[in-house]
């Protein structure tokens, strides 16, 4: 940003702008007459000219500053903001042959696994089984499954020790979210359908969907930046 | 080696019902989809019906809907198929199957059992 | 749902022949078609899944290609135990649908 850009931004008032108080623009006639009044007329004029100029100086330096502050505050921010972008980079788009739903990307296997080598498979993809977060997302999902008899594994199993079914990121499931047909038991996986929800063995081999989450950079809004 | 079993077949008159069962062994029954397919006389092979392992998703042609039932229990390694209002045309020859997912073949076969539905 | 076209319905062939089964889809199913081989009076028995993966303990002779719409199987030396029937099968979208079968006889 260049300092030319900084006193374009500056809207001071017009009596104390830079423009309005300098010295050709004082009135002609008051700097006019017998040579006492003249001398005391010029001696005014100068200190008028002098507490103008010293005014208009400080007026603009003030300023100036308040603006730099501003400018280097925003310059911190945008730093900061580059810093985190830098520390982890976000995804733009969607890798080739991943599917994009609305924050995420999708990848729908076209072979079968049983549901650890799933995980391990979009672990290797730098990616996770789905984690769903409502039934809203859940509908979306299910919209792009194209035949009722294609069952996807998900980033969901039953955890024997807290007797609970478990995302993989650690958290559980809201029962308001899923309704799971099946069995809520020891070595229960969740796949999805084109219509519903299933408990299945997690050794079953079905297809699986991996997740990449889509981090676009936010671009906060600065003057000039 | 997996093995399949099919049973319960014989003659039906028109309108009657039917249960086959097939008896699995040699593998890990609850983690495969099953399926029923079946063949009339000197034809070819129809897909009937196809339950998930669990037993929770079930699909069907749309020859049977409504009349056929597929189900399955899992300690008893045991696939079944309840046939309802029998016709002359599910006559055949009707076979289980391990598989039936898409995108999954049918790897492992019976051999079959014999379904006449005459008066 | 989709229809699948097996051709020829029949053929004579010798032992030690190059025999050609070509199976044709009403719509793109990509590349999930099998192919089994039925003989008489047996159960039908899986060889090439996904169009040309050999299922394990099939003989080498079999080998499947295609995707899309057109998909062949050949048998590159016909042996005595390979006169049979032979259905193509997708796993595309239910109803799962086998072609009407062919029939390799001996000449």
């Known amino acids: 940003m260049d300092q030319q850009a900084i006193y374009a931004e500056l809207n001071l008032p017009t009596d104390s702008g830079p423009e309005s108080s300098s010295p050709s623009s004082l009135p002609r006639d008051v700097c006019q007459g017998s040579p006492w009044h003249q001398f005391a007329l010029k001696l005014s004029c100068a200190g008028i000219i002098l507490l103008v100029l010293v005014v208009t100086g400080l007026s603009v330096s003030v300023t100036s500053l308040i603006q730099k502050s501003s400018i280097e505050k925003c310059s911190v921010d945008i730093q900061q903001s580059r810093n985190k972008t830098t520390e982890r980079p976000g995804l733009l788009n969607c890798p080739i042959y991943w599917q994009q739903l609305r924050e995420k990307c999708l990848l729908f296997s076209h072979t079968v696994n049983p549901w650890n080598n799933s995980l391990a498979d979009c672990s290797t993809k730098e990616s996770s089984l789905l984690l769903i977060r409502d039934k809203d997302e859940l509908i979306h999902t299910q919209n792009l499954i194209r035949d009722k008899a294609i069952l996807f594994w998900i980033g969901l199993n039953f955890s024997l020790s807290e007797k609970n079914w478990k995302w993989i990121n650690g958290s559980f499931l809201n029962s308001n979210d899923l309704e799971i047909r099946g069995d809520a038991k020891e070595n229960s996986c969740i796949s999805i359908s084109q219509t519903s929800v299933y408990s299945e063995y997690c050794s079953t081999e079905i297809r699986w969907i991996c997740q990449k989450e889509l981090t676009p950079v936010r671009n906060k809004v600065y003057p000039d930046s | 080696e997996v093995q399949l079993v099919e049973s319960g077949g014989g003659l039906v008159q028109p309108g009657g019902s039917l249960r086959l069962s097939c008896a699995a062994s040699g593998s890990t029954f609850s983690s495969y989809a099953m399926s029923w397919v079946r063949q009339a006389p000197g034809k070819g092979l129809e897909w009937v019906s196809t339950?998930?392992?669990?037993?929770?998703?079930?699909y069907y042609a749309d020859s049977v809907k409504g009349r056929f039932t597929i189900s399955r229990d899992n300690s008893r390694n045991t696939l079944y198929l309840q046939m309802n209002s029998l016709r002359a045309e599910d006559t055949a020859v009707y076979y289980c199957?391990?598989?039936?997912?898409?995108?999954?073949?049918?790897?492992?076969w019976g051999q079959g059992t014999l379904v006449t539905v005459s008066s | 749902d989709i229809q699948m076209t097996q051709s020829p319905s029949s053929l004579s062939a010798s032992v030690g022949d190059r025999v050609t089964i070509t199976c044709r889809a009403s719509?793109?199913?990509?590349?999930?078609l099998n192919w089994y081989q039925q003989r008489p009076g047996r159960a039908p028995k899986l060889l090439i899944y996904a169009a040309s993966s050999l299922l394990s303990g099939v003989p080498s002779r079999f080998s499947g290609s295609g995707s899309g719409t057109d998909f062949t199987l050949t048998i590159s030396s016909l042996q005595p135990e390979d006169f049979a029937t032979y259905y193509c099968?997708?796993?595309?979208?239910?109803?799962?649908?086998f072609g009407q079968g062919t029939k390799v006889e001996i000449k």
């Open positions: 719509q793109s199913i990509s590349s999930y």
């Open positions: 339950i998930s392992g669990s037993g929770g998703s079930t």
């Open positions: 099968q997708q796993t595309y979208s239910t109803p799962l649908t």
């Open positions: 199957a391990r598989g039936g997912l898409i995108p999954s073949g049918f790897d492992y």
